[in-house]
């Protein structure tokens, strides 16, 4: 079985649509792919992180529609039966099995565009998406392990003498918290049923010449730094300032 060749240097395209949602696509330039396409004999699987609440477009291998017999999208989401959306060129018919999410649709009429779109990506869209194209020359596949990214809510506060708490709430995947300067720190992770993780880092600084500390939160959706001035008064709280 053949498959379309991924372009390793591909950058994620992001644009704004009319409804002000960012749109992500891993679709490649048609000419560029068709040249690579017939050379590869393995199924292509791409891990694709996508921000929640954006729109995503997933593409089939770049087979000329004139060579197509059947296109099938298989969608496997956690805890749900496998959904399939199929199009048969000969009869110009589409069929669906176990597909209940109305936000996952063909981009347009499948006889014109075989791509699949997810409107307003949600955590529930985490899963595996595969396009199977059947042609007289063989079956061509492209699969996506879609990882939905959720930006954590970051807070920083002082809870007692020379101790600060930095929280990255409900991120997906878990955020990483680091401090400047380094202190005596303990980090806890709390896992939520929807797949998000809250990371809480509590740090204490004995050294009295440390007056300002910075919490740096690293996450796939972007990094954030907050700083706070350590107060000597026990129990006092001071809100953080954002860099």
């Amino acid at each position: 079985e053949g498959a379309a060749q991924p372009n390793n240097s591909l950058m994620l395209q992001t644009s704004k649509e009319n409804h002000a949602l960012a749109s992500s696509s891993l679709c490649m330039d048609e000419k560029q792919i068709t040249q690579n396409y017939s050379k590869v004999l393995a199924e292509v699987n791409t891990s694709w992180p996508v921000k929640m609440a954006t729109n995503a477009v997933l593409c089939c291998p770049p087979i000329a529609l004139r060579n197509l017999i059947i296109i099938t999208w298989e969608i496997i989401l956690r805890g749900q039966p496998s959904c399939t959306k199929a199009y048969k060129k000969e009869t110009n018919e589409t069929k669906e099995t176990n597909c209940t999410d109305e936000r996952i649709t063909w981009v347009s009429r499948p006889d014109q565009n075989s791509d699949l779109q997810i409107r307003t990506v949600a955590i529930t869209h985490d899963g595996y998406y595969r396009c199977i194209m059947v042609t007289p020359d063989g079956n061509f596949h492209r699969g996506y392990h879609l990882q939905v990214l959720v930006t954590p809510e970051v807070t920083l506060f002082q809870n007692r003498n020379r101790t600060a708490v930095c929280k990255a709430v409900a991120g997906k995947p878990a955020a990483h918290i680091s401090w400047i300067p380094e202190g005596d720190c303990a980090t806890k992770q709390e896992y939520w049923s929807n797949g998000t993780v809250t990371v809480k880092s509590t740090c204490h600084w004995e050294v009295h010449n440390v007056s300002t500390v910075t919490c740096h939160v690293s996450h796939l959706t972007g990094n954030k730094s907050l700083y706070i001035e350590l107060l000597p008064v026990p129990g006092a709280k001071k809100s953080a300032k954002l860099y």
Partner: antibody, heavy 118, light 102 residues
Framework: QVQLKESGPGLVQPSQTLSLTCTVS????????VSWVRQPPGKGLEWIAA???????FYNSALKSRLSISRDTSKSQVFLKMNSLQTEDTAIYFC????????????WGPGTMVTVSS | DIVMTQSPTFMSISVGDRVTMSCKAS??????VDWYQQKTGQSPKLLIY???NRYTGVPDRFTGSGSGTGFTFTITNLQAEDLAVYYC?????????SGAGT
């Protein structure tokens, strides 16, 4: 529930035209395609013709010149006409519905026996 | 036209046995092969669609596998009521074609 029932003459003279009707219930012909499949006595299944949900018509290339498939969506009926019948066209003729989820035949009529004989 | 070659033609087996039959397509049909059971005097009944998907209400002793040109249909723990002719049929493109039956 979904049902299909074939009706036809039973006996046809050689060189004559066969007219079959498939009457369906429990689904709309604009949602599911219907095919005709035949089975000569003691033999396997032979697909003859189909009409898609959109009204497109498709034929077995070996029989195409002799076949015509049509439908009346308001009456929920699919028609098959086959001319120039020969004894080798003797068979049980089934109509079958395209599935909701894919292109398989999920419901079949009981079949109607057509004998070509003088 | 796509030719579907089914084997064996006949099988003589016992209740409780495992039965395997195969179907070979003359060209690539993807996973677009369906398996039907036909008992004497009845119309065919869909068991497996898209090569490996069990149709609604079909017991799990019936399984299918394969892709491309080679397909297999298996019945485990054969029951007396499974006595029938089994057909594979490609539903990739018209004309749909079936094997001669097992």
């Amino acid at each position: 529930q979904v049902q299909l029932k074939e009706s036809g003459p039973g006996l046809v003279q050689p060189s004559q035209t066969l007219s079959l009707t498939c009457t369906v219930s429990g689904f709309s012909l604009t949602n599911n395609g219907v095919s005709w499949v035949r089975q000569p006595p003691g033999k396997g299944l032979e697909w003859i013709a189909a009409i898609s949900s959109g009204g497109g018509t498709f034929y077995n290339s070996a029989l195409k010149s002799r076949l015509s498939i049509s439908r009346d969506t308001s009456k929920s009926q699919v028609f098959l006409k086959m001319n120039s019948l020969q004894t080798e066209d003797t068979a049980i003729y089934f109509c079958a519905r395209d599935g909701d989820w894919d292109w398989y035949f999920d419901f079949w009529g009981p079949g109607t026996m057509v004998t070509v004989s003088s | 036209d796509i030719v579907m070659t089914q084997s064996p033609t006949f099988m003589s087996i016992s209740v409780g046995d495992r039965v395997t039959m195969s179907c070979k397509a003359s060209q690539n049909v993807g996973s677009n092969v369906d398996w039907y059971q036909q008992k004497t005097g009845q119309s065919p009944k869909l068991l497996i669609y898209k090569a490996s998907n069990r149709y609604t209400g079909v017991p799990d002793r019936f399984t299918g596998s394969g892709s491309g040109t080679g397909f297999t249909f298996t019945i485990t723990n054969l029951q007396a009521e499974d006595l029938a002719v089994y057909y594979c049929m490609q539903s990739l493109s018209f004309p749909y074609t079936s094997g001669a039956g097992t």
